[in-house]
Interface confidence: medium
Amino acid sequence: TQHGIRLPLRSGLGGAPLGLRLPRETDEEPEEPGRRGSFVEMVDNLRGKSGQGYYVEMTVGSPPQTLNILVDTGSSNFAVGAAPHPFLHRYYQRQLSSTYRDLRKGVYVPYTQGKWEGELGTDLVSIPHGPNVTVRANIAAITESDKFFINGSNWEGILGLAYAEIARPDDSLEPFFDSLVKQTHVPNLFSLQLCGAGFPLNQSEVLASVGGSMIIGGIDHSLYTGSLWYTPIRREWYYEVIIVRVEINGQDLKMDCKEYNYDKSIVDSGTTNLRLPKKVFEAAVKSIKAASSTEKFPDGFWLGEQLVCWQAGTTPWNIFPVISLYLMGEVTNQSFRITILPQQYLRPVEDVATSQDDCYKFAISQSSTGTVMGAVIMEGFYVVFDRARKRIGFAVSACHVHDEFRTAAVEGPFVTLDMEDCGYNIPQTDESTLMTGRA
């Protein structure tokens, strides 16, 4: 998937210092064998940079070649740079790996924003700050690309964590996580804690900082507060979910809930913004504008063209509303809500003209491919991708940026009827196209 514009990454505020977190084993859910134990080696294993994605260190081949790999729940290919490129400090050198096997097959992946193409093969792969296992996985060795790698981003490949249905060139190419689960005793589950900084970071700050955690095979209780609430994965392609209600500062948008999921709603770590279908976006902006009407902002701000800036340290967070998305619950007629703050949906950026102020981009944007719950949403929460039980869990992240008055929230249960009607049934055409233009 396209790496788009992403949020700044850092240990964040409001939680225990990241380096001091220890998982609590005592209150692991007892009915989930194999997910118990210490994940301390995986905590803080993500890094990243403003607008350029969260990445994890992986090794490929024998002897192991270390690469930084973008974590993307909106695609399903494991693809790495395998040829010199001006934006890559290093790349996968297949000829140096004694365990590389060529599949004698090419792969071509176009995005709205550029493309990559390469050659398919398999090799041994491991995650140093992950489970202590090595798996043979499919790898797309990227030999040619256009506007895919980002100058200074510090990652050399992409780890698509979604399902085989959207893998390229077709669904017969087993994604990495499927291979991992099949070949090892790692439970079919991973969880992500993405930590936004709340302000722009320069290159050295990024390299010295933490972007969050990807816990493979389990749930680390130190990464969240309160309870985990689960929503069903509607269909295993993207991580598709169903939104049943949207509120701005507690005011219902009062739209037919099908509109919220037109033509799908997905959870995607490879997209920065909260992206909303056109009608929903327009209603949400109207409501956010009304709620924040004590200050007037240029229309260009709401459309993503202009920044809004305040004197350093004076951002009036309190004038902006909270946004709640109600998700279908696991029990019939039961939903729960996740609530994000302006600290999540106002993305800190450097004004290219001046750096004296605190400047922000409105990180909610219009979509023609349905709702995308990108980093704007994920940075508020610890998100559990429970593939084994076909569900996604949300809890308040221990590292989300907030202030003394409000915090992100996950609350329930709420009674919501006819939630199944909220899902949109996509006409059966070719659905193998990757989602593109993922700001």
Epitope: P298, D299, G300, V349, S368
Partner: antibody, heavy 120, light 108 residues
Framework: QVQLVQSGAEVKKPGSSVKVSCKAS????????ISWVRQAPGQGLEWMGS????????NYAQKFQGRVTITADESTSTAYMELSSLRSEDTAVYYC?????????????WGQGTMVTVSS | EIVMTQSPATLSVSPGERATLSCRAS??????LAWYQQKPGQAPRLLIY???TRATGIPARFSGSGSGTEFTLTISSLQSEDFAVYYC??????????FGGGTKVEIK
Amino acid sequence: QVQLVQSGAEVKKPGSSVKVSCKASGGTFSSYAISWVRQAPGQGLEWMGSIIPIFGTANYAQKFQGRVTITADESTSTAYMELSSLRSEDTAVYYCARSGGTKYGMLDVWGQGTMVTVSS
Amino acid sequence: EIVMTQSPATLSVSPGERATLSCRASQSVGSNLAWYQQKPGQAPRLLIYGASTRATGIPARFSGSGSGTEFTLTISSLQSEDFAVYYCQQLYTWPPRTFGGGTKVEIK
């Protein structure tokens, strides 16, 4: 240094359409906005609409709504402006210009302009 | 839509003299205003944004002031290359991002 290079002059018949291209080079294309501005002979500047390529959605001035379509192809870093149902008063120089990355959304880089003549 | 009115339509000034151009908005645009310079046969060039900030490479003799509805572009000492048409543009409420009608600065 960002540059915007536009397609060449066009002569069109009334009632037909014209599609002008604007190719960006030397900088980021996707997350900036591309606006289209026209200038009739001896007249002032008139803003027609804009698009942020990465979002793919365009905004248009009411005057041109339904007659103009602004699109962008990120793979080639090119924006397009198509104007349909042309009439003689659409004879003008059409400019593309870039904005974004700042508080004010000013048009800081301009294309060289494309002369469109509508004549029977 | 917001209407931008520039005055005068034409300003005759001698080289070395000061030129003051005015731009009025039909409703408040805060400091969301830009000034552009256009010479015959050329594309416009950004001079001032945020009502008073000079764009990169613009000489110090150009200055902008004002906020709300009244704005001024001042050229402190006109050089021969400054004779051109100047446009203001509001960047507050849009679409459309309206331009003023322009002020032509000519040699007296």
